[in-house]
């Protein structure tokens, strides 16, 4: 993520493109365009003769990380000779307008290349003034004014979760370690068939719905956030979140688990079949044989109505079941229905039968070339 240890931090922002700084008082935007409502402006001390003191100082770039700390860095290698430049700062037209010295310098090859300010020293909505100075040439100094609310970079979104809203709709949720209403988000998603990400802007609500999901494809989602537009107008996005994956072949992800699953299913199936067979044979032994209607008449005739003789019921039990009254014998026969077997004839295809279950839709996969 974005929160590195200090030595790394000191190098991280030296890599950002640095602007050349002129001798005249200028107002610059971060991309170098002149603008009277800039996030910062820079002044240098003009002199008549060209000497060391007229060399422009490198531009200072400040970024506020999740409003936890701020790094202000400069390109120390732009100096003609290694120089430990010093940094002072204050807040314009505020209670914090006392000039402060940097108390925590960042170094690159043992030369000062930045300053880190802690949370208590950051006031987002006051104009931050930063001054870089060459201690050997006190006249050689540069001052910049910054709107810190436009320089916030949040941490990457965390805890991405996916859940199905319906058979074909997915919802992505995430968290930010910051006041959520201050951030906007960019969601990117793709399948393994896509050669490019599809992206969607999301407001402060930190949730995203994908209305149409192909069940046969695998999806990847990632999110990044920006401090914009409600609390500031930052241009820089956070790092991307860790991606989250959803889709077809998740069961094949771990070959060991896949094999284990196959074994468990096989053993379970065999166990179930054996159990059913055992139950069947046990029932065969313990339950009386129940005749089918087809041969009931023959049995009654053959055994002269003696139920216990052919059923396997003990003589004692049979006697206890004997009624103390006589009944007429009533023969029952089944008349087969007209019209043949169930499901034959028109209108009987599986597609036309009403069922409480829906068959999944068919997908035709086409390469996106």
């Amino acid at each position: 993520m974005l929160k590195p240890s200090l030595p790394f931090t000191s190098l991280l922002f030296l890599q950002l493109p640095l602007l050349g700084v002129g001798l005249n008082t200028t107002i610059l935007t971060p991309n170098g365009n002149e603008d009277t409502t800039a996030d910062f402006f820079l002044t240098t001390m003009p002199t008549d003769s060209l000497s060391v003191s007229t060399l422009p100082l490198p531009e200072v770039q400040c970024f506020v990380f999740n409003v936890e700390y701020m790094n202000c860095t400069w390109n120390s290698s732009s100096e003609p000779q290694p120089t430990n430049l010093t940094l002072h700062y204050w807040y314009k037209n505020s209670d914090n307008d006392k000039v402060q010295k940097c108390s925590h310098y960042l170094f690159s090859e043992e030369i000062t290349s930045g300053c880190q300010l802690q949370k208590k020293e950051i006031h987002l909505y006051q104009t931050f003034v930063v001054q870089l100075q060459d201690p050997r040439e006190p006249r050689r100094q540069a001052t910049q004014m910054l709107k810190l609310q436009n320089l916030v970079i949040p941490w990457a979104p965390e805890n991405l979760t996916l859940h199905k809203l319906s058979e074909s709709q997915l919802e992505l949720n995430w968290n930010n370690r910051f006041l959520n209403h201050c951030l906007e988000h960019l969601v990117q998603y793709r399948t393994d068939w896509d050669h490019s990400w599809t992206e969607q802007s999301v407001d402060y609500r930190h949730k995203f719905s994908l209305p149409s999901v192909d069940g046969q494809k695998r999806y990847t989602f990632r999110v990044r956030s920006r401090f914009n537009p409600l609390c500031g107008s930052a241009q820089h996005w956070s790092e991307w979140s860790h991606p989250i994956h959803w889709g077809s072949n998740t069961s094949k992800e771990n070959p060991f688990l896949f094999a284990l699953e196959a074994v468990v299913i096989s053993v379970g199936s065999m166990g179930l079949i054996i159990s059913l067979l055992c139950v069947y044979f046990w029932l065969e032994r313990t339950m009386p044989r129940i005749p089918t209607l087809k041969n009931l008449e023959d049995l009654v005739t053959e055994y002269h109505g003696n139920f216990s003789a052919w059923s396997g019921v003990s003589k004692g039990l049979a006697e206890s079941l004997q009624p103390d009254y006589s009944e007429r014998l009533c023969l029952v026969s089944e008349i087969p229905p007209k019209g043949g077997a169930l499901g034959e004839g028109p209108g009987a295809s599986p597609c036309n039968q009403h069922s409480p279950y829906w068959a999944p839709p068919c997908y035709t996969l086409k390469p996106e070339t």
């Epitope: 990117q188 793709r190 393994d192 050669h195 490019s196 990847t220």
Partner: antibody, heavy 116, light 108 residues
């Protein structure tokens, strides 16, 4: 027919800069993310950078982060790679390719040589 | 970063042979695996994407399979024009996109 033609390569000293261009035709440029992939002659392929369809999202290999900038001009159907603070290890044939994640079509490449 | 390892680094085969090249990822990449062919002095050409989907215009003798960490590219009956270097590439965890070191297929 899809065509990608790179230009802008050449010999440059360490610390110098170059801007590579890739002119495209034969496909809907706006529909594709685009990438740069480099190859040291006789060696394997190394992904350098990608940009999404509208230019709003860029990704870089760690080896070039902070030194190279990818951009695109959809109106001109062109892809660019601004290379600053060049090093000897940046010497390679630079291919532009369609796609951000895998690469459907490739240009023949432009050779960048960083040497003192 | 995910490392991609191809094997073998080079192999010799004859026209008509069935050839298999394998690619192993240092962690599971699901089916986010693509294969390219590169001939000397030419740009690489996409053969297979999403592990097993044949890019349009690529002969059906090329096929890809695998999921997770182990993948194969198979050429069912080698043709003279198939002698080239083949690369696998993962697009699961990006950035960075990473390639295998390549497999050089030579005529025996």
């Amino acid at each position: 027919e899809v065509q990608l033609v790179e230009s802008g390569g050449g010999v440059v000293r360490p610390g110098g800069s170059l801007r590579l261009s890739c002119a495209t035709s034969g496909f809907t440029f706006d529909d594709y993310g685009m990438s740069w992939v480099r190859q040291v002659p006789g060696k394997g392929l190394e992904w350098v950078s990608s940009v999404n369809r509208n230019g709003g999202t860029t990704d870089y290999a760690d080896s070039v982060k902070g030194r190279f900038t990818i951009s695109r001009d959809n109106a001109k159907r062109s892809l660019f790679l601004q290379m600053n603070s060049l090093r000897a290890e940046d010497t390679a044939l630079y291919h532009c390719a369609t796609g951000e994640l895998f690469f459907d079509y490739w240009g023949q490449g432009t050779l960048v040589t960083v040497s003192s | 970063d995910i490392q991609m390892t191809q094997s073998p680094s080079s192999l010799s085969a004859s026209v008509g042979d069935r050839v298999t090249i394998t690619c192993r990822a240092s962690q599971s990449i699901s089916s986010y695996l693509n294969w390219y062919q590169q001939k000397p002095g030419k740009a690489p050409k996409l053969l297979i994407y999403a592990a097993s989907s044949l890019q349009s215009g690529v002969p059906s003798r090329f096929s890809g399979s695998g999921s997770g960490t182990d993948f194969t590219l198979t050429i069912s009956s080698l043709q003279p024009e198939d002698f080239a270097t083949y690369y696998c590439q993962q697009s699961y965890s990006t950035p960075p996109i990473t390639f295998g070191q390549g497999t050089r297929l030579e005529i025996k």
